[in-house]
């Protein structure tokens, strides 16, 4: 069961698997959640011990029974990992800790105006895990305003000390706030020849990449495939680092693949979730249980529901034995990866899906696109919402996109003349406007957040957030779309669609069924030539056919320009403005969401 509360002055006895240092019990709980085996923890605060070296210790614990004896101890704080919970889990920690110094290797020292600037520097430095900043009140004059960037092998401090007039905090890479480049390509027949920091077994290069991404020290990796000539190295995933943060050299080798950690583009790509099945494959590890079930999907479900299960192997039933039930071997290991991978065994293996909740929901695969036609089908664009106004009478006002369980992203110009959020209704999971009746459930709007630099659509900053009064439960027909990753500036999107209930031509009416159109992106230079009287800024993005014919139009405003890249849909643009609709050589102009990712995160994570 999911227990989120912390138990003050309680110590969990036994079950120790590791000790780390964390600045708070809350952070200790997050570390426990991300550890492959930790189910419970005890955090030692300042008052729990006379010995300062014991302060801020976070003892990670495991238990076969999923519980441990409780002992009263002043200053200790204990709790359970979030592994048992179904809610989204994030490693993002924006907290700044006052009068604490997290210890690590101080590899970079520079002047900074503020703790925030120091944290940004850490976030944009490939090696940085956390930082300490000496404030302007720091006693030693020559150390004032010094920003120390730090890293450790584990990503957690090697110790935490009380120190007056300093502040400390973590890199915000896991909050998707890094400006570092994000290299998604996997390079075939390539070995990166740099120092190995760890090695694990993986069934393919993509699992190897995910392991690298959430390993704090891993910057890139090399994976030896099943066909690799040296048998002892088959399925071996080498986690690597280098001083520069990039491979110093590459060696061409058949049957090896290499790639990069996705730590800088983490929020829009599945990192923790290994959802594939590996046929004719056995994962070896410590056996947790053996259960008779029908099929490998049922086996995966069993593993997902068993909190200690990390991976499984399903041995299909022989002929008609045992009512078609095969054996489901639930397994675990010290690091969450199989200790060995065997091929040609007839088994079907895979991983728990419990870790999927650590990934952003927006990375979930949705049903395939319906090719041809202009009318959408249910579940095709599950992030698309219809925003209604009830004043003077109820009508469709604008489109919008779900980007979080309480957040809709739309255009600022939609709210011209809207006096209060009370007159707004957000309908989610809607295909046809005719579905909306008096008793149709909707989401009220708690707050409208318009970009403070917005004046009019044509001059940019045409972006707004709606905070919903209640949270959205994600289903196949209503789920979020990923924001573009800041590390993806070089990506050229080739599969982009505009959707909405807007007019089909300039003088028309709102459509009943959600319409879709595939539209190519146009460079800003090209777009500027088409709109000589306007300034097309880098905060805008244009899309349209040279000959016209397909475009967003009145009523589509605020809706998404959705682009698919690497199997994940990204909200690349917000329908903003254009000259007429679908006119020749007049592309549609959209708010360039990439340029507002920081603004969105600042407002939604405040």
């Amino acid at each position: 069961e999911c227990v989120t509360r912390l138990f003050k002055d309680i110590h969990f006895e036994g079950g120790d698997i590791a000790t780390v240092f964390t600045p708070s019990a809350k952070h200790c709980q997050v570390v426990c959640t991300h550890h492959p085996r930790c189910l419970l923890f005890t955090f030692t605060g300042e008052s729990a011990s006379e010995d300062p070296t014991q302060w801020f210790t976070c003892v990670l614990k495991d238990s076969v029974t999923e519980t441990l004896p409780r002992v009263n101890r002043t200053g200790a704080i204990s709790g359970y990992s979030f592994k048992q919970c179904s809610h989204q889990i994030s490693a993002c920690n924006k907290d700044i800790y006052v009068d604490l110094d997290m210890k690590g290797i101080n590899y970079n020292s520079s002047l900074a105006k503020s703790a925030q600037e120091c944290q940004e520097r850490c976030t944009d430095d490939i090696h940085c895990h956390f930082f300490t900043y000496a404030t302007r009140q720091f006693p030693s004059l020559e150390h004032r305003n010094i920003c120390l960037l730090k890293h450790t092998q584990t990503g957690t401090p090697t110790g935490i000390m009380k120190l007056d007039k300093v502040v400390t905090g973590f890199s915000l890479k896991s909050c998707a706030l890094s400006n570092l480049a994000c290299i998604r390509d996997v390079f075939p027949n390539t070995v990166f020849a740099d120092s190995n920091i760890d090695s694990v077994m993986a069934p393919d290069a993509f699992v190897c990449r995910r392991i690298c991404t959430h390993h704090p020290g891993c910057l890139f990796f090399t994976f030896f495939s099943q066909e690799w000539p040296k048998e002892s190295q088959r399925n071996l995933c080498l986690l690597k680092t280098s001083e520069s943060g990039l491979p110093s050299t590459r060696i061409k080798k058949s049957k090896a693949l290499s790639g990069f950690s996705l730590q800088s583009c983490r929020h829009s790509i599945p990192v923790f979730c290994h959802s594939s099945f590996y046929h004719d494959t056995d994962f070896l590890g410590e056996e947790l249980d053996i259960v008779a079930v029908k099929g490998h999907e049922a086996c995966q479900k069993l593993c997902t529901n068993a909190v200690r299960c990390q991976f499984f192997t399903y041995a299909p039933a022989q002929a008609s034995c045992n009512e078609g039930k095969g054996k489901c071997y639930l397994k675990l290991s010290s690091n969450g990866s199989p200790t060995k991978i065997l091929r040609g065994t007839g088994g079907i293996s895979g991983y728990t899906l419990r870790l999927c909740k650590m990934d952003n929901e927006c990375t979930t695969k949705i049903k395939p696109r319906i090719v041809g036609g202009t009318a959408s089908v249910r579940g095709e664009w599950p992030w698309q919402v219809t925003l209604h106004t009830t004043s003077p009478t109820q009508r469709h006002l604008c489109g919008g996109s779900i980007i979080g369980n309480q957040w809709i992203l739309t255009a600022a110009h939609c709210f011209y003349g809207v006096e209060s959020p009370k007159i707004l209704r957000v309908y989610i999971g809607i295909l046809n406007q005719s579905e909306i009746k008096e008793d149709t459930s909707f989401f009220g709007v708690q707050e409208i957040i318009i970009h403070d630099q917005y004046k009019m659509a044509e001059s940019g900053y045409d972006i707004a957030l709606l905070k919903l009064e209640t949270t959205v439960n994600y289903t196949d027909s209503q789920r979020p779309i990923c924001l573009p990753s800041k590390g993806d500036r070089n990506v050229i999107y080739t599969d982009c669609w505009v959707t909405g209930w807007g007019y089909r031509k300039l003088r028309d009416k709102i459509q009943n069924t959600l319409q879709k159109a595939k539209i190519p992106l146009v460079t800003n230079d090209e777009c500027q030539k088409r709109y000589r009287g306007h300034k097309i800024t880098h905060k805008m993005i244009c899309a349209g056919y040279r000959e016209g014919g397909k475009d967003a139009c009145k009523g589509d405003s605020g809706g998404p320009l959705s682009c698919k890249h690497n199997e994940v849909w990204h909200l690349v643009g917000i329908t903003s403005w254009g000259e007429g609709c679908a006119q020749r050589e007049r592309p549609g102009v959209y708010t360039n969401v990439l340029e507002y990712v920081d603004w969105i995160l600042e407002k939604t994570q405040a």
Partner: antibody, heavy 125, light 107 residues
Framework: QVQLQESGPGLVKPSQTLSLTCTVS??????????WSWIRQHPGKGLEWIGS???????YYNPSLKSRVTISVDTSKNQFSLKLSSVTAADTAVYYC?????????????????WGQGTTVTVSS | DIQMTQSPSSVSASVGDRVTITCRAS??????LAWYQQKPGKAPKLLIY???SLQSGVPSRFSGSGSGTDFTLTISSLQPEDFATYYC?????????FGGGTKVEIK
Amino acid sequence: QVQLQESGPGLVKPSQTLSLTCTVSGGSIYSGAYYWSWIRQHPGKGLEWIGSIHYSGLTYYNPSLKSRVTISVDTSKNQFSLKLSSVTAADTAVYYCARDVDDSSGDEHYGMDVWGQGTTVTVSS
Amino acid sequence: DIQMTQSPSSVSASVGDRVTITCRASQGIDSWLAWYQQKPGKAPKLLIYAASSLQSGVPSRFSGSGSGTDFTLTISSLQPEDFATYYCQQYHIVPITFGGGTKVEIK
């Protein structure tokens, strides 16, 4: 088919920075299957690899030039560029850009299959 | 860095002759080797990749062989348009390196 065209000044003063651009036409620079390379050839001599870049920004440089070389890519303009700082007369050469195939589909096709026609750069005051 | 040594540095031959150029790597490079042809004032042209694979559009009189450290480019019957300089190139490990070149001249 894909064509490459080098552009940039033919004469550079010593100690200055040599800047060349290679424009890719007839195909996209935005592909995981290629590295985009710079090679030079001193008068009457053999070929010397300077460095390569992937559209993602991943670069490799010749260690003998690494401290002076920067290769960058601009996917929106379908171009990649070379900057060589602190040049001397020894950097006088014909500079070529080339497409280096690193095919993601397997082992089948490698090597620098498309080259620019080359641009002569003279370093002289 | 891997040194690539080509021999001979020049060869005189007549039309119809069989010409063999060798290339030796200072360490094993598997089959990650390419051969290029360069004519005066022109850019190099890829002939062979992966030691023995013929680049499309290249006449079948050109062939490559070898693996590890020793490689050979053979022109089975020299044609007038084949008089040029030939370079081998390893791409097994960065930095990519070229051989010094072999000039095939008219006898």
